[in-house]
Interface confidence: medium
C-alpha cells in the first residue's frame, strides 16, 4: 500500500530530524499550521514541502549552521540531507505542482518538524487501521 510506504519513510525521516539539535534547528520558518483551517491535506503537505525547501535553500551554506567543528559540519550536512528527503516525499504525497505560502506566523524549525510528525503519525494510524 503506497500510502504506508511513503508515510513510513516520512515518519522515519522526521524521527531522525527531531532526535538531534543542531546550530540551525532553532532558526525560524513560516508556521503553515497556525492557520490551516479550510486547507486540504494535500495543500498542507505541499506547503510544508515549500517551507522546508525555502529553509534548506537558504541555510544549506549558512556559515552559522555549518559550524566550526567537524561534528557540527557533519550534523548540519545530515540535517540538510534529511530535509531534502522529507521535501521529496511530501511533494510525492501532495501531488501538487505548487502552492502559496504566506509569510505570516513564525515557528522554529524544530517545532515545525514536531508538529509535522504529529500530523503524519495521526495519518498513519488512520491509514493502517
Amino acid at each position: 500500500h503506497k500510502c504506508d510506504i511513503t508515510l513510513q519513510e516520512i515518519i522515519k525521516t522526521l524521527n531522525s530530524l527531531t532526535e538531534q539539535k543542531t546550530l540551525c534547528t532553532e532558526l525560524t520558518v513560516t508556521d503553515i499550521f497556525a492557520a490551516s483551517k479550510n486547507t486540504t491535506e494535500k495543500e498542507t503537505f505541499c506547503r510544508a514541502a515549500t517551507v522546508l525547501r525555502q529553509f534548506y535553500s537558504h541555510h544549506e551554506k549558512d556559515t552559522r549552521c555549518l559550524g566550526a567543528t567537524a561534528q557540527q559540519f557533519h550534523r548540519h550536512k545530515q540535517l540538510i540531507r534529511f530535509l531534502k528527503r522529507l521535501d521529496r516525499n511530501l511533494w510525492g504525497l501532495a501531488g501538487l505542482n505548487s502552492c502559496p505560502v504566506k509569510e505570516a506566523n513564525q515557528s522554529t524549525l524544530e517545532n515545525f518538524l514536531e508538529r509535522l510528525k504529529t500530523i503524519m503519525r495521526e495519518k498513519y494510524s488512520k491509514c493502517s487501521s
Partner: nanobody, 116 residues
Framework: EVQLLESGGGLVQPGGSLRLSCAAS????????MGWARQAPGKPLEWVSW????????YYADSVKGRFTISRDNSKNTLYLQMNSLRAEDTAVYYC?????????WGQGTLVTVSS
C-alpha cells in the same frame, strides 16, 4: 514587535577587551538561537558567532576563535559577546541578530574601533 538593542561598543587599544550586550524583546528569547555579525568598512557582513537557546552549542568564525566568547542569559533576555585580544581588523559595526524565516532580524549595531 521584535527589538534588539546592542551596547558596549567603543574605542579600544589593540590587545584590549570589550563586552558587547544585546537586550532582546518582543519574542520568547529563550526559544531561539541568537548571534553576532559584523561589518567592517567596505567589506561584506560576516557572521562572528552563534549560540543555540540552551547555550550548549556555539559557532565561531575562524578569525575570532579563541579570542571571542558568546554567551546568553535567558532570564535577562540578553546576549553577550566578550571580545579579548582585540586587533585592528576587528574594527567594525557589530550587530546582534535573530533569524526570522528566510531573513535575519538585526539590531541597529554598535561600533567597535580598535586603534592605538
Amino acid at each position: 514587535e521584535v527589538q534588539l538593542l546592542e551596547s558596549g561598543g567603543g574605542l579600544v587599544q589593540p590587545g584590549g577587551s570589550l563586552r558587547l550586550s544585546c537586550a532582546a524583546s518582543g519574542f520568547t528569547f529563550r526559544n531561539f538561537g541568537m548571534g553576532w555579525a559584523r561589518q567592517a568598512p567596505g567589506k561584506p557582513l560576516e557572521w562572528v558567532s552563534w549560540i543555540i537557546s540552551s547555550g550548549t552549542e556555539t559557532y565561531y568564525a575562524d578569525s575570532v576563535k579563541g579570542r571571542f566568547t558568546i554567551s546568553r542569559d535567558n532570564s535577562k533576555n540578553t546576549l553577550y559577546l566578550q571580545m579579548n585580544s582585540l586587533r585592528a581588523e576587528d574594527t567594525a559595526v557589530y550587530y546582534c541578530a535573530k533569524s526570522l524565516g528566510r531573513f535575519d532580524y538585526w539590531g541597529q549595531g554598535t561600533l567597535v574601533t580598535v586603534s592605538s
